[in-house]
């Protein structure tokens, strides 16, 4: 069915059943960042995946206790990372496995860029990250 371009059509795209925001975050080291996932259906738990490079496969995100926290409330899931570090750079994906169908839906990703690099080596590494 059509939405007359007044709202996002749930039938519209491969990423349409789970919507991730924002698409890009750039923050200085030490800051706190939040990324969100909105689901059309609240019937399934959300997990978070992470990859450092564009052409890597995302891996299950290992939540660092006390620094990384995930929360889910109805159709909104949030990942909070406190005191961000250079090694947090990468792309974060939320993923929902539906309880009734076992289908898995993945968000389109949030890219995190941690700014404020202290060494030349880190700066060079940052510059070689694929856009």
């Amino acid at each position: 069915a059509r939405s007359e371009d007044r709202y996002r059509n749930p039938k519209g795209s491969a990423c349409s059943r789970i919507w991730q925001s924002p698409r890009f975050i750039a923050r200085k080291r030490g800051f706190t960042v939040k990324m969100h996932c909105y689901m059309n259906s609240a019937s399934g738990n959300v997990s978070w995946l992470w990859k450092q490079e564009m052409d890597e496969n995302p891996q299950q995100l290992k939540l660092e206790k006390g620094r990384m926290e995930e929360s889910q409330n109805e159709s909104l899931a949030t990942l909070t990372i406190q005191g961000i570090r250079f090694e947090d750079n990468g792309i974060y994906f939320c993923q929902q496995k539906c309880n009734n169908t076992s289908e898995v839906y993945q968000g389109c990703g949030t890219e995190l860029r941690v700014m404020g690099f202290s060494t030349l080596a880190q700066l060079k590494q940052r510059n070689t990250l694929k856009d």
């Epitope: 069915a1 007359e4 371009d5 007044r6 709202y7 996002r8 919507w19 925001s21 698409r23 389109c108």
Partner: antibody
């Protein structure tokens, strides 16, 4: 021209259910999402959910998830919204709206003991 | 849920003068395909809502060109270049990027 004609006002007791109808004409009923939006007296608007008349796929606002049911009858080009376990705060005007573009005239539902 | 905040709550205007309504969202409304689903509609007293603008700035058919919409990301504005008597009513912004769809609290435009 596009027309959405809704059923008449209803008075219900707390705990009861109400079913509002919305008869569409002037366009292909199965082509557009039918949404339901409510407006409490002197309040703002709340989106309740939507249904695709072609296959009955629904998306509900989590605020109403366990109480609302949206259905369609393709043979009569009519959409229905049923709200159960009514409470006084459900007193509102309920609108059907084609893709939140064309709107019905609204149905006042009063919940009172 | 995405919170839509409109200001002012009430806008008394002089006929023929411009009017401006602000709408802010708690999250960016830019979607993954580059569209921003920010809409405006008007509700005259005792009537059903009437759509004015979709996709931030696209006027609905039959809407006078004295209405215009602008903005991006989280900040949006509806402008009426010269207010006419028939423009009296409540104006709502609403977002269609994130589910559930959410509406602003409304801005009441009245003639001074």
């Amino acid at each position: 021209q596009v027309q959405l004609v809704q059923s008449g006002a209803e008075v219900k007791k707390p705990g009861a259910s109400v079913k509002v109808s919305c008869k569409a004409s002037g366009y292909s009923f199965t082509t557009y999402w039918m949404n339901w939006v409510r407006q409490a007296p002197g309040q703002g608007l709340t989106w309740m959910g939507m249904i695709d008349p072609s296959d009955s796929e629904t998306h509900y606002n989590h605020l109403f998830k366990d109480r609302v049911t949206m259905t369609v009858d393709k043979s009569t080009s009519t959409a229905y919204m049923e709200l159960s376990s009514l409470r006084s705060e459900d007193t509102a005007v309920y609108y059907c709206t084609r893709a939140i573009g064309y709107w019905g005239q609204g149905t006042l539902v009063t919940v009172s003991s | 849920d995405v919170v839509m905040t409109q200001s002012p709550l009430s806008l008394p205007v002089t006929l023929g003068q411009p009017a401006s309504i602000s709408c802010k969202s708690s999250l960016s409304l830019l979607d993954s395909e580059g569209k921003t689903y920010l809409n405006w509609f008007q509700q005259r007293p005792g009537q059903s809502p009437r759509p004015l603008i979709s996709l931030v700035s696209k006027l609905d058919s039959g809407v006078p060109d004295r209405f215009s919409g602008s903005g991006s990301g989280t900040d949006f504005t509806l402008k009426i270049s010269r207010v006419e008597a028939e423009d009296v009513g409540v104006y709502y912004c609403w977002q269609g990027t994130h589910f559930p769809l959410t509406f602003g609290g409304g801005t009441k435009v009245e003639i001074k």
